[in-house]
Interface confidence: low
């Protein structure tokens, strides 16, 4: 339950008279009007839209709303010189030239300033040669290429397909492999669910579709010309060859009607396995070159992208704390898309403006948090999340000192079956009580509780009779408040029944389709989601802005920390006789577990006992709170990996958009096997467990009694 | 099929230097970590150096350590050995070598060799 | 640095013979130990990897065991083929070294 600030407000301005106050109607009405022309990061019509969310917020009644604008980094397509991809025979004549943009959605055939498919910061490039398929191009695809099958990519053109891991990473593999451009593609089996028609007749990605997306590895660099320091009017900028995380070859995504005349005629080694076949009606062989009639044709792609320095605007809004001011909790979405955005960002920026437009319509009457809450619409999140990273390297020494929480406002849905809740542990058990109090939105589970549909369609793993929250990884603009500084952060949308449905993300993702009508028509047509979404980000936001005692528990920190411990011990524990060789020993870690179990056990219950009604005691355990997630910060960062400081967590090295326990040990016992010097090898492994221990033990000491 | 092709070798004097380079092909270069062994007439074998696939981590034996340096060129599928201050012992045949994946740093792919004579 | 040492360091043996080769680490490899072919004038040839793992496109009349400090190159019935310089190599820890060699002549 809600515990409110009691001095200021009346009681009727509780968590339900905010939550009451939230309406399906207006995300519609709102979603429409964010949804009508693109707003492609860097363009006019995107600053236009900037300018209006900060009128807008204004009028709903924030205290101030301003515009924080950057000169960043971006990547367009030339508009004269067009990309594509051909097949040329041995003459180098064209014999097949893939489509220049998506058959525009009815209704939007006169839209101008809609960017055609291009991967963002692709170099330019003409490169021809052989095509090999490698999968989804993740690490595990070119082990299986290069170490089994014995195929060589060096000086090919690899064609992966979309799905599994973040495309950064199928390119950064690619490069190390030796492919001199990659063609990303949307393979029906990841993209088209059976059963449901394309688009504009169902959700389903037509065969004209294609994926956007930017396809850096900026490790949470932000603006790849000024890592560590915000892209400002005064700023030093990086020369474009000293940039971080461009790719350094060609790169090109198409849909599957243009994928199926490239990968009918390839030829040379079968696929592997099964797992390497899509749905389209070709061999999947995976090359190199095409097979025997075609030997002589090669692939070649025409990139003429250029990357610029560009302005970037987010909007920031204030609703200012009555008792602590000085402690923030952000609410943050991204309102920059590829197209119409009818999902990624809209369907998130809706929300956010209808959770402002609640708490605005609370302080018109009276009342105001306990704490300061801070709204944001980021710019050029789609482009490496630029726009939330810059204003947190600007803001940084404010947001380690005060911030309290981030809550991330992205996509509200994915599909429409169930909750999806990616948080620090900390914020477990607010998620779960928040939800019971919730009513669920799901057919068949009228007049129950959100935890209670939510567990059921998604158990825990772990944990029988509560729900799956996962960790947090990166891909959204949460990275920056949690990777780097360590704020407290959580996410939540409703997604699709992952059991049934193995396609990516959901099937008309970054696409020209993403439109409005895809929403209303057939993932939400009463809203009734996306109000739930509102009211959980809301939710969220409402406690951790206004309850007297921060809504943290250490205790969940304490179980997961024991069950990140065991994991990475029965990683190490698959070369029992290297650790024993090395005298690797994972005592230290365990020991530190130990100690922060029983520290954060006797915390919890210094908390229930304490004086709340004397300020001073109350903000000295609600720091220790707020500062437990700072204290797994490590100023150094992970190995080649700067940006990423957090020791529980850091995204995936092979796939950003997934959460990795332990990362500094697991890196280092990835494919130890295949490492040059064996015993710098497991000293490595031995010295990332020395941080990790360290870590877990001095943060443990943040929570013990101060004197 | 892998070729590694060494070239630079010849005859040098006492405290020159020479650079030794190995053109690579048939595999993907910036995957595998890259050695040079070297044998001097009618003796064994003895390992000189390696550099990992990327190029950020070299190794050197004791006796050529602050004497000769191991750089690759991934654009190129270049394998380089920069030797100065030679001596009379550094004479020897120089293969380039390719590292097998797997436990063991064992070297499945060797090039022909080039001799490397330090007289005066 | 550890030393590898071969034994013996040459041989004489016949055609169908078997032929036993031996290595002994200063310190523990684990596994980590590799057997080459090196004939004259020629670059060596790797034959077995990890202590055991036969290398593909090798007999199968060779074969390698051991862990630890001592291993061991068996070549289960000689070939005209077969006669030349076996070394041995360790991948443990670097600098990498290679046992003196074992010359298997003809008898």
């Known amino acids: 339950k809600s515990s409110n600030e009691a001095t200021n407000i009346t009681p009727k301005h509780n968590m339900k008279a905010f939550l009451d106050e939230l309406k399906a109607e207006n995300i519609k009405k709102f979603l429409y009007n964010f949804t009508q022309i693109p707003h492609l990061a860097g363009t006019e019509q995107n600053f236009q839209l900037a300018k209006q969310i900060q009128s807008q917020w204004k009028e709903f009644g924030l205290d101030s709303v301003e515009l924080a604008h950057y000169d960043v980094l971006l990547s367009y397509p030339n508009k004269t010189h067009p990309n594509y991809i051909s097949i040329i025979n041995e003459d180098g004549n064209e014999i097949f030239n893939t489509s220049l943009f998506e058959p525009p959605p009815p209704g939007y055939e006169n839209v101008s300033d809609i960017v055609p498919p291009f991967s963002a910061f692709s170099p330019q490039g003409m490169p021809e040669g052989d095509l090999v398929y490698v999968n989804y191009a993740r690490t595990e695809d070119f082990f299986k290429l290069e170490r089994d099958m014995k195929i060589n990519c060096s000086g090919k053109i690899v064609i992966a397909r979309y799905g599994k891991v973040f495309r950064g990473n199928k390119v950064k593999n690619a490069q190390l492999a030796g492919a001199k451009g990659v063609i990303l593609y949307s393979d029906p089996a990841d993209y088209f669910a059976p059963g449901v028609k394309s688009y504009p007749d169902g959700w389903n990605l037509p065969g004209g579709g294609v994926q956007r997306g930017n396809i850096l590895n900026l490790n949470g660099a932000g603006d790849p010309l000024t890592p560590g320091y915000p892209a400002n009017e005064y700023a030093y900028r990086r020369g474009i060859a000293e940039a971080v995380g461009l790719p350094s070859i060609p790169v090109h995504p198409i849909g599957y009607y243009d994928a199926q005349k490239l990968l009918e005629k390839m030829g040379g080694s079968a696929p592997p396995d099964s797992s390497w076949r899509g749905s389209l009606k070709v061999p999947y062989n995976v090359g190199p070159g095409f097979t025997g009639n075609f030997s002589t044709q090669k692939v070649k792609m025409h990139i003429h992208s250029t990357n610029e320095v560009t302005r970037i605007y987010n909007v920031i809004g204030t609703l200012r704390g009555a008792v602590e001011p000085d402690r923030y909790v952000i609410l943050g979405g991204h309102r920059d898309s590829w197209v119409f955005g009818g999902i990624d960002p809209q369907s998130g920026a809706a929300v956010v403006h209808e959770i402002v437009r609640s708490f605005g319509t609370l302080k018109k009457e009276g009342w105001r948090p306990r704490r300061t809450i801070l709204f944001a619409s980021w710019d050029a999140e789609e482009f490496g999340l630029l726009g939330s990273t810059e204003w947190a390297e600007e803001n940084s020494r404010l947001l380690q000192e005060r911030g309290v929480a981030y809550i991330n406002a992205d996509s509200s849905i994915e599909g429409n079956y169930t909750l999806r809740v990616d948080c620090t542990p900390l914020m477990y058990s607010l998620v779960h009580n928040l939800t019971k109090e919730l009513k669920s939105p799901d057919e068949g589970f009228e007049g129950k509780s959100l935890y209670e549909s939510w567990t059921k369609k998604s158990p825990s793993p772990e944990f029988s009779g509560m729900p799956r929250i996962s960790k947090l990884g990166s891909g959204n603009d949460f990275e920056v408040f949690f990777q780097r500084l360590g704020i407290a952060s959580g996410r939540a949308r409703y997604t699709k029944n992952w059991e049934t449905n193995k396609f990516s993300g959901y099937p008309l993702y970054h696409s020209v389709y993403e439109t409005y009508e895809l929403v209303e028509k057939f993932y939400d047509p009463m809203f009734k989601y996306h109000l739930t979404v509102a009211q959980v980000r809301g939710g969220m936001v409402f406690e951790l802005a206004n309850s007297i005692v921060l809504p943290f528990d250490c205790r969940d920190y304490a179980v997961v920390l024991r069950k990140y411990a065991d994991k990475i011990y029965s990683i190490s524990m698959k070369h029992p006789q290297e650790m024993k060789t090395y005298s690797v020993s994972f005592d230290s870690l365990f020991s530190a577990v130990k100690n922060f179990t029983e520290i954060a056990s006797k915390f919890s219950e210094r908390l229930q006992d304490f004086d709340k009604s004397n300020p001073i005691v109350l903000r000295m355990m609600n720091d220790q709170l707020m500062f437990l997630e700072r204290a797994f910060i490590d100023p150094l960062g992970l190995p080649d990996r700067p940006f990423y400081r957090h020791v529980i967590y850091a995204p995936s090295s092979h796939n950003k958009y997934a959460g990795e326990s332990f990362p500094g040990i697991y890196d280092a016992l990835f494919d130890i096997e295949s490492k040059v010097d064996p015993s710098k090898a497991w000293g490595e492994v031995k010295r990332q467990i020395y941080v990790a221990a360290f870590t877990v033990q001095a943060a443990a000491e943040t929570l013990s009694e101060v004197a | 099929e892998v070729q590694l092709l060494e070239s630079g070798g010849g005859l040098v004097q006492p405290g020159g230097s020479l650079r030794l380079s190995c053109a690579a092909s048939g595999f993907t270069f910036t995957t595998y970590t890259m050695s040079w062994v070297r044998q001097a007439p009618g003796k064994g074998l003895e390992w000189v150096s390696a550099?990992?696939?990327?190029?950020?981590?070299?190794f050197y034996a004791d006796s050529v350590k602050g004497r000769f340096t191991i750089s690759r060129d991934n654009s190129k599928n270049t394998l380089y050995l920069q030797m100065n201050s030679l001596r009379a012992e550094d004479t020897a045949v120089y293969y380039c070598a390719k590292i097998k994946y797997g436990s063991g740093s064992s070297i499945d792919s060797w090039g022909q060799g080039t001799l490397v004579t330090v007289s005066s | 640095d550890i030393q590898m040492t071969q034994s013996p360091s040459s041989l004489s043996a016949s055609v169908g013979d078997r032929v036993t080769i031996t290595c002994r680490a200063s310190?523990?490899?684990?596994?980590?130990l590799n057997w080459y072919q090196q004939k004259p004038g020629k670059a060596p040839k790797l034959l077995i990897y990890g202590a055991s793992r036969l290398e593909s496109g090798v007999p199968s009349r060779f074969s390698g065991s051991g862990s630890g400090t001592d291993f061991t190159l068996t070549i289960s019935s000689l070939q005209p083929e077969d006669f030349a310089t076996y070394y041995c190599?360790?991948?443990?820890?670097?600098?990498?070294?290679f046992g003196g060699g074992t010359k298997v002549e003809i008898k």
């Open positions: 190599q360790q991948g443990y820890s670097v600098p990498w070294t």
């Open positions: 550099i990992s696939g990327s190029g950020g981590n070299t």
């Open positions: 310190e523990s490899i684990n596994r980590y």
